[in-house]
């Protein structure tokens, strides 16, 4: 069996065995090693010498196997745009930014560039659940039957009405989309404004 070629090695068809960790160098028609994440090319390869890599300086990074002669500059997240760092930049990874909780991404250019506050959903409604959270503003939908939500909030969920009988109580006033059922002790008289409803 043929020995495995080690960079630099000649390539007639302009392709390399390991596309992730090697690249084709057209000047010499050879395959050379890429530099691993966190490093850059400090000396290019030749027919007799493979790529020489060096570690990225502080506040710079390269995320992938590469043949870049520089490292990318770390960029801070912009809190004015609602973005916040959730993990710092390292030599192998750029600063990880995310919209602050309760915000959604309002502008996207390869990555999020601007976040805005989620709109409140008024009483009687809740935010429709999305497959991908943080990608769009709230769309408020009415509480389904038998549920209520009594605040203006971007995140409050509709809750089921209390079932008075489960607590050994009776219903004094039915629940609405904006309020829970009112329960009372079965021995208590109804409030005066409801006393007329006892007939039949």
């Amino acid at each position: 069996s043929q020995p495995q070629a080690v960079p630099p090695y000649a390539s007639e068809n302009q392709t390399c065995r390991d596309q992730e960790k090697e690249y084709y160098e057209p000047q010499h028609r050879i395959c050379c090693s890429r530099c691993p994440p966190g490093t850059y090319v400090s000396a290019k390869c030749s027919r007799i010498r493979d790529t020489v890599c060096a570690t990225c300086a502080e506040n710079s990074y390269n995320e992938h196997w590469n043949y870049l002669t520089i490292c990318q500059l770390c960029r801070p997240c912009d809190p004015v745009m609602g973005l916040e760092e959730i993990a710092p930049c390292t030599s192998k990874r750029k600063t990880q930014c995310r919209c602050q909780p309760g915000m959604f991404c309002a502008a996207w250019a390869l990555e999020c560039t601007h976040c805005e506050l989620l709109s409140d959903c008024p009483p009687g409604t809740e935010a429709e659940l999305k497959d991908e959270v943080g990608k769009g503003n709230n769309h408020c939908v009415p509480c389904k039957a038998g549920h209520f939500q009594n605040t203006s909030s971007p995140s409050a969920r509709c809750q089921p009405h209390t079932r008075c009988e489960n607590q050994g109580l009776v219903e004094a006033a039915p629940g609405t989309a904006q309020s829970d059922t009112t329960c009372k002790n079965p021995l208590e008289p109804l409030p005066p404004e409801m006393s007329g409803t006892m007939l039949m």
């Epitope: 809190p79 916040e84 959730i86 602050q100 309760g102 989620l118 991908e132 959270v133 995140s155 969920r157």
Partner: antibody, heavy 115, light 107 residues
Framework: EVQLVESGGGLVQPGGSLRLSCAAS????????MNWVRQAPGKGLEWVSG????????YYTDSVKGRFTISRDNAKNTLDLQMTSLRAEDAAIYIC????????WGQGTMVTVSS | DIQMTQSPSSLSASVGDRVTITCRAS??????LAWFQQKPGKAPKRLIF???SLDSGVPSRFSGSGSGTDFTLTISSLQPEDFATYYC?????????FGGGTKVEMK
């Protein structure tokens, strides 16, 4: 190196008040949400309160709303928690944490509520 | 509020074991989830953010997966220093919430 140092804990009677502080260094304080998290002895972690980077938005867990007030001074790199009407169930170690995903934590300050 | 339900609440394992801890959110949180390790008398330390991204300096035996409502923390080969309590936390929306914790003890 990020450092978060809490102070202000102590023994207080039920109904009493206490002001906790957190001194931050080693990062751009004004770029991060800052939070208070508490942990009662032998219990789990509970988020208490948070404040947005500019200080314009504050958030609280339901059990402390109306009793606790979070504030920050971006010029001095400090985070405060004013606690009033303290209850026995508020007794815990209170820890200051950087960022809404709690990237870094302080060591905490103990709050004891007892008569 | 988003409830985070962690299971199991405790487990016994031996060095070298593969350990899996699960966390379920009461509603979808996309990938806005972190995992923390806490040892007695110490502050928590974050291991994973965005559900699956490993924090700098955290050993590669730790990994996270999941999206939406179901998440997993896996320790591929438990080491002596991994005996601790682990918490999940969602940061999709306020109030920020933690799971109840999973104590990993020596068998």
């Amino acid at each position: 190196e990020v450092q978060l140092v809490e102070s202000g804990g102590g023994l207080v009677q039920p109904g009493g008040s206490l002001r906790l502080s957190c001194a931050a260094s080693g990062f751009t304080f004004s770029s991060y949400t800052m939070n208070w998290v508490r942990q009662a002895p032998g219990k789990g972690l509970e988020w208490v309160s948070g404040v947005a980077p500019s200080g314009d938005r504050t958030y609280y867990t339901d059990s402390v709303k109306g009793r606790f007030t979070i504030s920050r001074d971006n010029a001095k790199n400090t985070l405060d928690l004013q606690m009033t009407s303290l209850r026995a169930e508020d007794a815990a170690i209170y820890i200051c944490a950087q960022g809404f995903a709690f990237t870094n934590w302080g060591q905490g300050t103990m709050v004891t509520v007892s008569s | 509020d988003i409830q985070m339900t962690q299971s199991p609440s405790s487990l016994s394992a031996s060095v070298g074991d593969r350990v899996t801890i699960t966390c379920r959110a009461s509603q979808g949180i996309s990938s806005a989830l972190a995992w923390f390790q806490q040892k007695p008398g110490k502050a928590p330390k974050r291991l994973i953010f965005d559900a699956s991204s490993l924090d700098s300096g955290v050993p590669s035996r730790f990994s996270g997966s999941g999206s939406g409502t179901d998440f997993t923390l896996t320790i591929s080969s438990l080491q002596p220093e991994d005996f601790a309590t682990y918490y999940c936390q969602q940061y999709n929306n306020y109030p920020l919430t933690f799971g109840g914790g999973t104590k990993v003890e020596m068998k």
